[in-house]
């Protein structure tokens, strides 16, 4: 039986040209990690395997950056990174874990509500 | 004005299909998120999930994964939200409702679209 | 999903009346950068709902100052302080920090 959940860092919101951070953490499970996977939409921007460690796609090397832990740091953002992306925890004996992480990035001009950006 | 028009109300047979429209104006299209909510029962709402229009991005509720399909057509500045395999649980109220940048909100919504299911 | 818990479900008022509607969430709505997106919506009858408070406490573009927003992390609370014959509706309240996005279950306005 799966009895894990993942908490992730939450939806975030960000100005164009800086940079965030996404991450998820597994709990409640005993569960040995064997591989987490980046995704955003159908498209795969990074592996962290338990044996062999970081893989970055290499469309995204420019930008994605492993860690901090088993998170992903995304910099230089684009308003074209808006969107959702997921974390897919790989376990065993358990299976898979899914969670999900909303990004939207602002043009500056944006901060015509006051919104908070942060750059970490 | 912001504007989110949306079409009609639709009488459908159940394990038919249905297309809702929201024709959006007095904004810039694609500057916006795009959220669809259910209303049943005239009380629960329910978040179905979103359209990026910028890049064609969509995030659904997983409850509405294989229910609702959502699309875009940048050229006349309208969302679609297709409603699949309908049942009776599947009546209600539709809105669109814009994103409210910044603030994972929505400010503006549409008049609201009712579906009806029915044989 | 998180799971948004309005009180009360229905909440008997005077014109005049102040009243607190309450919203609580399952898990922490502040995300790790220390934002917190939580949202208040009016849905008056025959109408489309309408955004009154986003981000726990600022007001949306002309709504009266009588609508109050406050609270953090798991408890969050609307304040009405003079309620008007157009405040009656549904209340909502929406969490938008976690996938999927979820709505309270709505707090009904009505005269005793």
């Known amino acids: 039986m799966m009895t894990g959940t993942i908490e992730t860092t939450g939806n975030i919101s960000a100005e164009k040209g800086g940079s965030i951070i996404l991450q998820c953490h597994l709990s409640s499970t005993t569960a040995q990690v064997t591989q987490v996977n980046w995704e955003q939409q159908d498209q795969l921007l990074a592996i962290c395997n338990a044996d062999l460690g970081w893989h970055i796609s290499p469309s995204f090397k420019d930008r994605v950056a492993p860690g901090p832990g088993l998170g992903l740091t995304l910099q230089s953002l684009t308003v074209n990174d808006t969107g959702e992306y997921f974390c897919i925890y790989h376990t065993y004996p358990d299976g898979t874990y899914t969670g999900r992480i909303f990004l939207e990035v602002l043009e500056s001009s944006v901060a015509e509500h006051g919104a908070r950006f942060q750059i970490p | 004005e912001v504007q989110l028009q949306q079409s009609g109300p639709e009488l459908v047979k159940p394990g038919a299909s249905v297309k809702i429209s929201c024709k959006a104006s007095?904004?810039?299209?694609?500057?916006?998120?795009m959220n669809w909510v259910k209303q049943s029962h005239g009380k629960n709402l329910e978040w179905i999930g979103l359209?990026?229009?910028?890049?064609?991005?969509?995030s659904y509720n997983q409850k509405f994964k294989d229910k609702a399909t959502l699309t875009i057509d940048k050229s006349s500045s309208t969302a679609y939200m297709e409603l699949l395999s309908l049942t009776s649980e599947d009546s209600a109220v539709y809105y669109c409702?814009?994103?409210?940048?910044?603030?994972?909100?929505?400010?503006?919504w549409g008049q609201g679209t009712s579906v009806t299911v029915s044989s | 999903d998180v799971v948004v818990t309005q009180t009360p479900l229905s909440l008997p008022v005077s014109f005049g009346d102040q009243v607190s509607i309450s919203c609580r969430s399952s898990?922490?709505?502040?995300?790790?950068?220390?934002?917190?997106?939580l949202s208040w919506y009016l849905h008056k009858p025959g109408q489309s709902p309408q955004l009154l408070i986003y981000?726990?406490?600022n007001r949306f573009s002309g709504v009266p100052d009588r609508f109050s927003g406050s609270g953090s992390g798991t408890n969050f609370t609307l304040k009405i302080s003079t309620i008007k014959p157009e405040d009656l509706g549904v209340y909502y309240c929406l969490q938008g920090t976690h996938q999927p996005w979820t709505f309270g279950g709505g707090t009904k306005l009505e005269i005793k």
């Open positions: 981000g726990i406490s």
């Open positions: 359209i990026i229009p910028y890049n064609g991005g969509t």
């Open positions: 007095g904004y810039s299209f694609t500057g916006y998120t």
């Open positions: 898990q922490s709505l502040t995300n790790s950068y220390g934002d917190t997106y």
């Open positions: 409702a814009r994103g409210f940048r910044g603030y994972f909100a929505v400010d503006y």
